[in-house]
């Protein structure tokens, strides 16, 4: 299945974080979502074959990239308290 790391992370305000996702083998598309406690998931990015294919309602301090092996990183800079959330990765063909 899809694997993410790290599973838990504690950061202080203003710091930067990098989250990693490995898709299901053979999947070329990776999507990232943010789920704040008590709310539904909010779409952040979709990447397909290393190109950004979709962009959610987040400013540019949220960035992502996809590597040649189709794994992906999500970076969040200048962290705010409101960034505290569950970050989900999904993959598809």
């Amino acid at each position: 299945g899809v694997t993410q790391s790290p599973t838990h992370l504690i950061k202080t305000r203003g710091q930067q974080v990098t989250l990693r996702c490995s898709p299901i083998s053979g999947h070329k598309s990776v999507s990232w979502y943010q789920q704040v406690l008590g709310q539904g998931p909010q779409f952040i990015f979709q990447y397909y074959e290393k190109e950004e294919r979709g962009r959610g309602n987040f400013p540019d301090r949220f960035s992502a990239r996809q590597f040649p092996n189709y794994s992906s990183e999500l970076n969040v800079n200048a962290l705010l308290l409101g960034d505290s959330a569950l970050y989900l990765c999904a993959s598809s063909l």
């Epitope: 309602n57 400013p59 540019d60 301090r61 949220f62 990239r65 800079n77 200048a78």
Partner: antibody, heavy 119, light 111 residues
Amino acid sequence: QVQLQQSGPELVKPGASVKISCKASGYAFSSSWMNWVKQRPGQGLEWIGRIYPGDGDTKYNGKFKGKATLTADKSSSTAYMHLSSLTSVDSAVYFCARRGTGGWYFDVWGAGTTVTVSS
Amino acid sequence: DIVLTQSPASLAVSLGQRATISCRASESVDSSGNSFMHWYQQKPGQPPQLLIYRASNLESGIPARFSGSGSRTDFTLTINPVEADDVATFYCQQSFDDPFTFGSGTKLEIK
């Protein structure tokens, strides 16, 4: 070519509301974020907010929450901004502007709609 | 909110000379190797026009006389050489965080 055609000037009374439009052509309207920007006479630029026409998702500058409401009609490729409880400080030129492909910059702008609030 | 301070507020440059406009952000606007600062030109009675995106990338159709540089909090728009058609107000804009903000503008005149 990509174009954003805005509605004409509006003269409205204090306390009234107004809805201005921005009709897009030449690109995939539903999948491109639309932004709105305010410019008071002789002043600088203020970002009001953005809308994703595909699903209506919005984000507002806190300064304009309760003042501006953004909507979009996919069938006509038109974005709208409703301004309520108008006062003299709302007299301005309002621009719609499309998000660029590589970040939240604005690569195509409408010509602007002048809103004048006067009794 | 991120505050963008432009300087000078106005400048007069002779034709053929170099014009330099500064934009300073109240905090870094860099993320993952990109600087999310953009530059626009606005001529009287017209909407703004994108010149430079992500600090140093020239928008399609914009003359190479325009260039941008800088990172983190300090950014510069350079016009070299200045032409008569460049008379306008220039704005910087950050998209690093919400709400997006603009600088107060720099008015360029010909000496």
